[in-house]
């Protein structure tokens, strides 16, 4: 019905306005109604005036160009004619009156379907229901993949691709690791994974100053060491270093008053040549104070050595020894002075002997026959040494004596001459310059090492070796080594260190193997004005040790892996040092500073003297400990 | 005996030289400096000039440089002093003196102590026209 | 060249007395001061060296104290024999140099 409609419609508009020229009221005849009516007529006008005023030719030229009046006049009430609707989007036209409505293909909107939907962005439908990619296409979308994902057959959700099996060798030496969409070649830790090589490579942190002081790369790692030789340990960060502080302060006053005998380990302390009148003699006061029992005092010679007077100590007593053209001769007497308080010594030639007081008292008388000195030039010509002696006297004595002694002396008056120019040169060398109060003991101030040949070797025992060592330690500062055991590889098959525990104001005692600790014993009381003492016994099976708290053998998986690393080095050649590390590598042990403090060690059951060491260090004290600083009142 | 004894003294014009020698016994030359030391009439000392051991050093009060100079001859344990271009104030008793190094330390470093123990009686030098 | 000064440049005093010479040096000369005596018509004599020892024979009552640029002699009780000039004289360093000399007379 609807047709039959529109074509009576076509067949009055033809006969109306085609065949003949309509005006408004007439073409409102043919539609019958205004809105159509409305629509036509303006573009019903268009056409005449293309078709009558001779436009046809430019008309042709538009888009909605028509042949002939007809069809142009024919085409306006056709909404859908020409085309509104968006060619790509729409699916249909329907015209309506004086209006249109154009149909849309899926995926597509708007009045004419110009509009593509977004299904991508569709909130009913979040990524378009894709799992990973939505792709927006006009009309349409599809959904994709990441790199490292297929799609499945739902052509919506995606599959990760594991590269590892698909490729095995992809990552060369380096450990595939497949991850979601990718794969990762992995390295342990400290290394880099190096794309060229296909290989992890060491990372070189200390190329990357990761330490403050010093660095030690190694495969997969890096340790940082601080210099322990100058005072620093490493701080509890592991990278930065901090001073090693003094943990019980000394008094470490001294005065120059008092001459230090100890000042040097090998050699004389003070020389001292006269040329005086030959109506002098020799004669030597004094005061003296020291804890050692055997060393030099002072030796005078004659200017040709063809006399000498040695005035010394052994076993605590003063004893002189005497060459000279009439006589040879050695005595000791008095009583034992080497207890630590100062003693007035004198020692005078007169005309027929040679007089020794202490504290004024007359111990020894020497006969001579002549004078001890032959004077030269009218002159008496004497050499005097502190401490010590010319070398190709030590052949020369009545009686070997070790030279060293760890004393001091004040109030000298030699030749009766004073002190006078020697006490200016002293008291511009610190270094000679006596502490003012001393203890019993020995002195390590932190800043070398003392060094002796033990042999180890126990014929008797099964065991082969042992190293049992006992020590009585009232340390200064937390951290040092107190005794190492050096091959001549440059390693340290065996040390025992101090370091300051991570609980505050307590110290551990280290047990190392090379740079492996073995046994750490944790937060004692060490840096007191009280002495502590410590034993530990050591062979190829077994590590025992005592402590103020505990006595116990130590065993544990790992200890007799390393005791057999320090039994081959036993086996071989090992050098002690006590108080700290000669020139090995930073690496070779746990801990590298000098132990600071006073120390006694005995080693398998004898008392190491310091003075008899192979070398030391000249600040180490072999017979004398700094007291305890006391706080007074106004300090 | 330890003696020195100075001779060669004189009167002499300005412009004119002299030569003192000085004799040493009871000692070996060879083993000490020697100094010379003058003392012009109602005057104080004033040191002239000394010579090493070996003779490789020698020094000189700044008034008598380029004038006088001090030789030895340990051979003969004689010590001299030429004295050229002399002048009125060069007149004074000269004394020969030993310097005996009295106090000699060795302490990280040498140091000696000097002092003038043996001495003449002076030799007089008078310069006039 | 170091200046070395003497005061007083005399003195007079009693046998018995206490007399005390002091000596300046024009920079530090360490403890390199020597003292000597001269008595009319003789040579001079060496009493101290190095400040404060005493040259051998030299009676114990002659003392010397000082280092740096200041320097004393004493005598502790002034006998007969100890009337003349003395004269300190410095050794540190060429030319050796003498103060002007102190006379110490009879009062």
């Known amino acids: 019905a609807n047709s039959l409609l529109e074509e009576t419609k076509q067949g009055n508009l033809e006969r109306e306005c085609i065949e003949e020229l309509c005006n408004k009221e007439e073409a409102r005849e043919v539609f019958e109604n205004d809105p159509e009516t409305d629509y036509f007529y303006p573009k019903y006008l268009v056409c005449l005036r293309s078709f009558q005023t001779g436009l046809f030719t430019a008309a042709r030229q538009s888009t909605n160009a028509y042949p002939d009046l007809r069809s142009c006049v024919n085409a306006i009430p056709d909404q859908c004619s020409p085309l509104p609707c968006n060619e790509d989007g729409y699916m249909s036209c329907k015209d309506g009156k004086a209006s249109f409505t154009c149909t849309c293909k899926p995926g597509w909107q708007g009045e004419k379907c110009e509009f593509d939907i977004n299904e991508c962005k569709d909130p009913s439908n979040i990524n378009g229901g894709c799992s990973q990619i939505c792709d927006n296409t006009p009309g349409s979308y599809h959904c994709s993949c990441k790199n490292g994902f297929v799609m499945l057959s739902n052509k919506k959700d995606c599959k990760d691709v594991d590269e590892c099996s698909l490729k095995p060798s992809i990552c060369g030496t380096a450990v595939c690791k497949n991850i979601p969409g990718d794969f990762e070649c992995e390295c342990p830790e400290g290394y880099r994974y190096n794309l060229k090589s296909k290989s992890c490579e060491d990372i070189d942190e200390c190329s990357e100053n990761m330490c403050a002081q010093l660095c030690v790369n190694y495969p997969g790692g890096y340790t940082c060491y601080c210099d322990g030789k100058k005072g620093f340990k490493l701080a509890q960060d592991q990278k930065s270093c901090e001073v090693v502080s003094v943990c019980l302060p000394l008094n470490l006053d001294t005065k120059y008053e008092l001459l230090y005998l100890a000042e040097q380990f090998a050699g004389v302390v003070l020389y001292l040549k006269f040329r005086l009148p030959e109506i002098s003699r020799f004669s030597a006061e004094f005061d003296f104070r020291t804890y050692d029992s055997e060393g030099v005092i002072l030796y005078a010679e004659s200017i040709d050595h063809s006399a000498w007077l040695l005035i010394a100590l052994r076993g605590g007593k003063i004893e002189v020894q005497l060459k000279n053209e009439h006589t040879s001769k050695i005595t000791t007497g008095g009583d034992v002075i080497n207890n630590g308080l100062w003693n007035m010594v004198s020692v005078e030639e007169l005309e027929h002997s040679i007089s020794i007081k202490i504290a004024k008292e007359a111990v020894m008388d020497i006969n001579k026959p002549g004078p001890l000195f032959k004077p030269e030039n009218g002159l008496l010509e004497t050499k005097v040494y502190f401490a010590g002696f010319p070398r190709k006297v030590e052949s020369e004595l009545i009686k070997p004596i070790n030279p060293r002694l760890d004393g001091c002396i004040r109030s000298w008056n030699l030749m009766k001459q004073g002190a006078s120019g020697i006490k200016e040169i002293i008291q511009e060398k610190q270094n000679k310059h006596c502490l003012v109060t001393v203890e019993k003991g020995s002195y390590y101030p932190g800043s070398g090492i003392a060094q002796f040949h033990i042999d180890y070797n126990n014929v008797s025992s099964a065991e082969g070796w042992h190293v049992n060592v006992t020590l009585n330690i009232r340390p200064s500062t937390g951290t040092g080594v107190m005794l190492a055991l050096v091959s001549g590889n440059n390693t340290v098959p065996f040390a025992v260190s101090l370091v300051d525990s991570t609980s505050e104001k307590s110290q551990d005692i280290l047990l190392s193997v090379e740079n492996t600790v073995i046994y750490r014993i944790q937060a004692l009381s060490l840096c007191s004005d009280q002495q502590s003492h410590l034993e530990f016994r050591v062979n190829r099976n077994n590590l025992e040790l005592s402590t103020p708290l505990k006595i116990e053998t130590i065993s544990h998986e790992d200890l007799q892996r390393q005791l057999a690393v320090l039994d081959k080095a036993m086996k071989a050649k090992v050098a002690t040092y006590l108080g700290g590390l000669p020139d090995v590598p930073f690496s070779a042990t746990p801990v590298n500073a000098f132990y600071n403090g006073c120390m006694e060690v005995n080693i398998n059951g004898v008392q190491l003297d310091l003075d008899e060491a192979i070398s030391k260090h000249n600040d180490i004290r072999a017979h004398s400990c700094p007291s305890v600083w006391k706080k007074t009142k106004n300090s | 005996e330890v003696q020195v004894v100075e001779s060669g003294g004189g009167l002499v014009q300005p412009g004119g030289s002299l030569r003192l020698s000085c004799a040493a016994s009871g000692f070996t030359l060879n083993s000490f400096w020697m100094s010379w030391v003058r003392q012009a009439p109602g005057k104080g000392l004033e040191w002239v000039a000394n010579?090493?051991?070996?003779?490789?050093?020698?020094y000189y009060v700044d008034s008598v440089k380029g004038r006088f100079t001090i030789s030895r001859d340990n051979a003969k344990n004689s010590l001299y002093l030429q004295m050229n271009g002399l002048r009125a104030e060069d007149t004074a008793l000269y004394y020969c003196a030993r310097e005996t190094d009295i106090l000699t330390a060795y302490y990280s470093d040498y140091y000696s102590y000097y002092g003038m123990d043996v001495w003449g009686q002076g030799t007089t030098v008078t310069v006039s026209a | 060249d170091i200046q070395m000064t003497q005061s007083p440049s005399s003195l007079s005093a009693s046998v018995r007395d206490r007399v005390t010479i002091n000596c300046r040096a024009s920079q530090s000369i360490r403890s390199y001061l020597n003292w000597y005596q001269q008595k009319p018509g003789k040579a001079p004599k060496l009493l101290i060296y190095a400040a404060s020892s005493l040259q051998g024979g030299v009676p114990s009552r002659f003392s010397g104290s000082g280092s740096g640029t200041d320097f004393t002699l004493t005598i502790s009780s002034l006998q007969p024999e100890d009337f003349a000039t003395y004269y300190c004289q410095q050794s540190y360093s060429t030319p050796r140099t003498f103060g002007q000399g102190t006379k110490v007379e009879i009062k």
């Open positions: 010579i090493k051991e070996d003779g490789s050093e020698k």
